[in-house]
């Protein structure tokens, strides 16, 4: 007998995982056999849709690989022409393991700014998102928060926020981890230890320290009076993101030394500066202070002028007497560049014997000053014009430094060889007698201020000139 269709197993809610198979069963009793059609969200599912399989005369609907979009209400309708059509409906709930759709990326950020590390997820049930820093779960606080979207927001980024991060998406079906990303916190260059100002004696060694930090580690450059440092040695060391730069200077003039720390953030630079002044205390003190020792001269400038193996006085008021006195002589040549061939050897002899004075060893090593008569011979005869120019420049303040004040003796303050022949030193290069002087042209219209006595005569009236160093 004909029988109207009856659905004996109503459709139920089906939970299915993405990419898995989901089947709805719609068991129908009827005679004749019914036609069964299926709809999803009231839209007919076509028999030839390859994503579905319809079997058992239409009573089984199988979704071959569930997709996220398959969520919805599925209904089966049975009709055999006897009585009315019957329908049963059930829901497909697509369950999804967590999936991170927008993972975090490496971030470089400047300290104090806001950083956001994205972590957008999918999943059903909706995954909860947490973050791991290093090997430990990240705790939220007033600065650090996980947003509704799953992204991590860090306000006022600090150095200690730097590190490796990953986000974790979790629901009842599983857990997904992002790849590990790096948060790099860059820090503007900052000077931790500024160089200190010094008031030192001429010829001292001074080491200026400048310590800076920053991320990346800054570079340090030194500026002397507005220009790149032209002399001195720089030693640097880097430890724990701190750079320590030491500029060792041999002080021959005052100066303003600036330490500049620079680091780069993308295309921009940050710099920090600190300055120190080097002033020179009482220029003439080294000449007054007779603390020192006797040693052979082993320098260059006066090698041809000073007697071989002669002991010279090295003044320990300088940090490195030998170098300081050598530089004094060398600089004196540069300060007094244009001199006549007559003046040059005499001036060399005077300067070398004045700065590297003969030394009398003993319990207290003592410098032996040049005899006044030799000094006056250079001043009033050999170098009269040059001496006047120098004195004029001194009065007008045209010298770059005051070093020449140390280099040139005041003749009137020197002992006379007539007082005590052993109390002063002669200049071997000026061994001449009054007869030799007749050949020299007059150097000054003024009469010498003192009568120049006969100086010890020598077999040669020529002057020895250093082949390497001259005043021209």
């Amino acid at each position: 007998l004909p029988k109207a269709p009856v659905i004996t197993t109503p459709l139920e809610t089906v939970d299915a995982l993405v990419e898995e198979v989901a089947t709805f069963m719609c068991a129908v009793e009827s005679y004749p056999q019914p036609e069964i059609s299926w709809t999803r969200n009231k839209i007919l599912i076509k028999l030839f849709d390859t994503r579905y399989s319809i079997r058992e005369n239409g009573q089984l609907l199988t979704i071959l690989s569930v997709e996220d979009s398959d969520d919805g209400i599925y209904c089966c309708t049975a009709n055999n022409g006897v009585g009315g059509a019957v329908e049963s409906c059930g829901a497909l709930q697509v369950k999804m393991k967590p999936k991170i759709t927008r993972p975090p990326i490496n971030v470089k950020i400047i300290e104090g700014l806001k950083a956001v590390l994205p972590c957008t997820t999918m999943g059903n049930p909706k995954p909860s998102v947490s973050w791991i820093k290093g090997d430990s779960p990240l705790r939220e606080n007033s600065r650090i928060a996980v947003l509704e979207s799953g992204s991590l927001r860090i306000h006022n980024v600090q150095k200690e926020d730097a590190g490796q991060y990953r986000c974790v998406a979790k629901n009842s079906l599983g857990t997904a981890y992002s790849k590990v990303v790096k948060l790099e916190v860059e820090v503007f260059a900052r000077i931790l230890r500024a160089p200190e100002s010094h008031n030192v004696t001429f010829g001292s060694f001074v080491t200026l320290h400048c310590t800076a930090t920053g991320i990346p580690v800054p570079t340090i450059t030194w500026i002397e009076n507005g220009n790149a440092v032209s002399s001195g040695s720089i030693q640097e060391s880097v430890k724990d993101r701190v750079i320590d730069s030491r500029l060792q200077l041999f002080i021959t003039k005052p100066g303003l030394y600036t330490c500049i720390a620079t680091n780069k953030h993308g295309e921009k630079f940050s710099t920090a500066k600190a300055a120190a002044t080097i002033s020179i205390a009482e220029w003439s003190k080294p000449q007054k202070d007779n603390k020192g020792y006797c040693a052979q001269y082993r320098g260059e400038v006066c090698n041809a002028v000073l007697a071989k193996d002669a002991l010279v006085f090295l003044n320990t008021s300088y940090a490195d007497p030998e170098e300081a006195q050598e530089l004094l002589v060398h600089t004196a040549w540069n300060e007094l560049k244009v001199v006549s061939p007559v003046c040059r050897p005499a001036a060399e002899a005077l300067l070398c014997n004045h700065i590297f004075q003969e030394c009398s060893p003993g319990v207290v090593p003592t410098p032996i000053p040049i005899c006044r008569e030799y000094c006056l011979a250079v001043k009033e005869l050999f170098c009269a014009k040059e001496w006047l120019v120098m004195e004029e420049k001194t009065h007008r303040g045209l010298y770059r430094s005051e070093m020449h004040l140390l280099s040139v003796p005041e003749c009137s303050k020197l002992p006379s060889m007539h007082w005590d022949p052993t109390a002063c030193a002669r200049l071997p290069h000026l061994d001449y007698n009054k007869e030799n002087l007749k050949t020299f042209p007059p150097m000054t219209s003024s009469k010498p201020s003192v009568d120049i006595p006969n100086l010890p005569s020598s077999s040669s009236s020529s002057f020895s000139v250093s082949p390497t160093y001259s005043m021209t």
Partner: antibody, heavy 121, light 112 residues
């Protein structure tokens, strides 16, 4: 950072020649005297030659006089040692060293890592 | 030519004091020899410690000091540390002959 880097060492036959170079950086090269010092394998240090800041004079150990020539190029910040008529006793690590001041002699306050010169047939 | 002499080896206990000397085979060491002292650890380049008898170079610990002792130059290490174990060389300026700089044979210092 102050650096002295020697180069030019190697194996050479007795009677042969080598030219050592020392590239300086991190300091004002033309403000300092420079020296070459050598150290034979397992032996002590031996001063070889020195030159002041301006290259105006040169100084040598007696046994290398006439065979070795020290020179400097302040523009290139480089020190050189030209070694001719090499002997087996010249085999050593050759160090380039910086003086603490301008003159040729005195404390050597910075050293390179050395370059090995082997004189052998 | 004068030879610069040093003790071949010396030993000191950690925290102890030791004095290394530097002499000349003929004559005395004077300030005209400008004695310098160097330290060399195995496989490393030498490092200057003291120049011109008693001036310490920058960065050298204050436990190292230089002086004259009789007719010799001396290097004293006060409060020796394990890292002070090294070869120590003195160097003298020889000006009277033909301007030379001569190293001593070195002293091997062991910190026991």
């Amino acid at each position: 950072e102050l650096q002295l880097v020697e180069s030019g060492g190697g194996l050479v036959q007795p009677g042969g020649s080598l030219r050592l170079s020392c590239a300086a950086s991190g300091f004002t090269f033309d403000d300092y005297g420079m020296s070459w010092v050598r150290q034979a394998p397992g032996k002590g240090l031996e001063w070889v030659s020195a030159i002041p800041w301006n290259g105006g004079s040169t100084y040598y150990k007696e046994s290398v006089k006439g065979r070795f020539t020290i020179s400097r190029d302040n523009a290139k910040k480089t020190l050189y040692l030209q070694m001719n008529s090499l002997k087996s006793e010249d085999t050593a690590v050759y160090y380039c060293a910086k003086r603490s001041g301008r003159i040729a002699f005195g404390a050597l306050d910075a050293w390179g890592q050395g370059t090995l010169v082997t004189v052998s047939s | 030519q004068a030879v610069v002499t040093q003790e071949p080896s010396l030993s000191v206990s950690p925290g102890g004091t030791v004095t290394l000397t530097c002499g000349l085979s003929s004559g005395s060491v004077t300030s005209s020899n400008y004695p310098d002292w160097y330290q060399q650890t195995p496989g490393q380049a030498p490092r200057a410690l003291i120049y011109s008898t008693n001036s310490r170079l920058s960065g050298v610990p204050s436990r190292f000091s230089g002086s004259f002792s009789g007719n010799k130059a001396a290097l004293t290490i006060t409060g020796a540390q394990p890292e002070d174990e090294a070869d120590y060389y003195c160097a003298l300026y020889m000006g009277s002959e033909s301007r030379n700089y001569v190293f001593g044979g070195g002293t091997k210092l062991t910190v026991l």
